[in-house]
């Protein structure tokens, strides 16, 4: 089948990094500067993404792959392939349409992005509060109050809600 297809369609022989040039008798021509083709058999090359403004280049464009962008300091990526850059806030804050706002009492945000979330209500899961919450940290729930009787073995507190610098959202 492959052989038959290549006999019928000479473009199928054009590798990534080239395009099938109709203006030149369907010869495989290299992609022009600032363009790429990531698969073979393409009749055009795609324009390279340009990382401008708040975007910065994480990976340069090549003849076979598009450029990749990330965000300048103070911003973080949003969306597939970092399609947007969103302002960072501090831990203990959330980004609203009016900018960064401190978390209200009883809520926390341990990231530079995302919402202020209510502290976990340990009692709803049959547990007790081991470590109180702050604006930057969720409460840490421990064993149920009944488990804390004298002689009960000590419990290692669970890890904090999320590691700073990692996006849960």
């Amino acid at each position: 089948f492959e052989r038959t297809r290549s006999l019928q369609d000479p473009c199928s022989n054009c590798p990534a990094g080239t395009f099938c040039d109709n203006n030149r008798n369907q010869i495989c021509s290299p992609c022009p500067p600032n363009s790429f083709s990531s698969a073979g058999g393409q009749r055009t090359c795609d324009i390279c993404r340009q990382c401008k403004g708040v975007f910065r280049t994480r990976k340069e464009c090549s003849s076979t792959s598009n450029a990749e962008c990330d965000c300048t300091p103070g911003f973080h990526c949003l969306g597939a392939g970092c399609s947007m850059c969103e302002q960072d806030c501090k831990q203990g804050q959330e980004l609203t349409k009016k900018g960064c706002k401190d978390c209200c009492f009883g809520t926390f945000n341990d990231q530079k992005r995302g919402i202020c979330r209510p502290w976990t209500n340990c009692s709803l899961d049959g547990k007790s509060v081991l470590v109180n919450g702050t604006k930057e940290r969720d409460v840490v729930c421990g064993p149920s109050p009944a488990d804390l009787s004298p002689g009960a073995s000590s419990v290692t507190p669970p890890a904090p809600a999320r590691e700073p610098g990692h996006s849960p959202q």
Partner: antibody, heavy 120, light 106 residues
Framework: QMQLVQSGAEVKKPGASVKVSCKAS????????MHWVRQAPGQGLEWMGW????????NYAQKFQGRVTITRDTSASTAYMELSSLRSEDTAVYYC?????????????WGQGTLVTVSS | SYELTQPPSVSVAPGKTARITCGGN??????VHWYQQKPGQAPVLVIY???DRPSGIPERFSGSNSGNTATLTISRVEAGDEADYYC?????????FGGGTQLTVL
């Protein structure tokens, strides 16, 4: 490829409990909150709560507090929703949904749903 | 608790523009997300953060949000757009959905 695969349909008697599972694959399970949403026949979407897969921290809708427990098993990349004291009004399709990255909390990927029927 | 109000149904002819509204007190200050749900299927996110489209969602889908109303606009409506549409916001401690709007393509 990102996927959330839920356990199969359940039929329960009033007063019983049901536990629905949601296995995640194709992404870092510990990095995204997991939510549960239900939909009664012919009705709209109703949020039940979330679990932080990294810490196990939870938040429940007031309506379900005391009846719902959302947990996770990080080693199995699976979230669970248990609903107790079932009544006929709990007959619904239950969805798990991954929290996305947008400002203000969106749900970007959903499981296929699990039908729970409560009938005597 | 915060409430979101959607019209139960909207009808539109193929090729025309459908507008589905979502009302809420000062909703313009919140981020609104929209989901499409076809019969027997799970919801699919079609608009997030008022007006952004996830990859794979056609450009025909757009959103806006100001004042007390958010709007999902579907231009050049196709038969395949027939579905239920839900708006959603985050309000202090809970995720809130609108009641849903059934879009019928005539």
């Amino acid at each position: 490829q990102m996927q959330l695969v839920q356990s199969g349909a359940e039929v329960k008697k009033p007063g019983a409990s049901v536990k629905v599972s949601c296995k995640a694959s194709g992404y870092n399970f510990g990095g995204y909150y997991m939510h549960w949403v239900r939909q009664a026949p012919g009705q709209g979407l109703e949020w039940m709560g979330w679990v932080n897969p990294k810490s196990g921290g939870t938040n429940y809708a007031q309506k379900f507090q005391g009846r719902v427990t959302i947990t996770r098993d990080t080693s199995a990349s699976t979230a669970y929703m248990e609903l107790s004291s079932l009544r006929s009004e709990d007959t619904a399709v239950y969805y798990c949904a991954r929290e996305g990255e947008a400002v203000g909390l969106d749900l970007d990927y959903w499981g296929q749903g699990t039908l729970v029927t409560v009938s005597s | 608790s915060y409430e979101l109000t959607q019209p139960p149904s909207v009808s539109v002819a193929p090729g025309k523009t459908a507008r589905i509204t979502c009302g809420g007190n000062n909703i313009g200050s919140k981020s609104v997300h929209w989901y499409q749900q076809k019969p027997g299927q799970a919801p699919v996110l079609v608009i997030y953060y008022d007006s952004d489209r996830p990859s794979g969602i056609p450009e025909r889908f757009s959103g806006s949000n100001s004042g007390n109303t958010a709007t999902l606009t579907i231009s050049r409506v196709e038969a395949g757009d027939e579905a239920d549409y839900y708006c959603q916001v985050w309000d202090s401690s809970s995720v809130v959905f609108g009641g849903g709007t059934q879009l019928t393509v005539l």
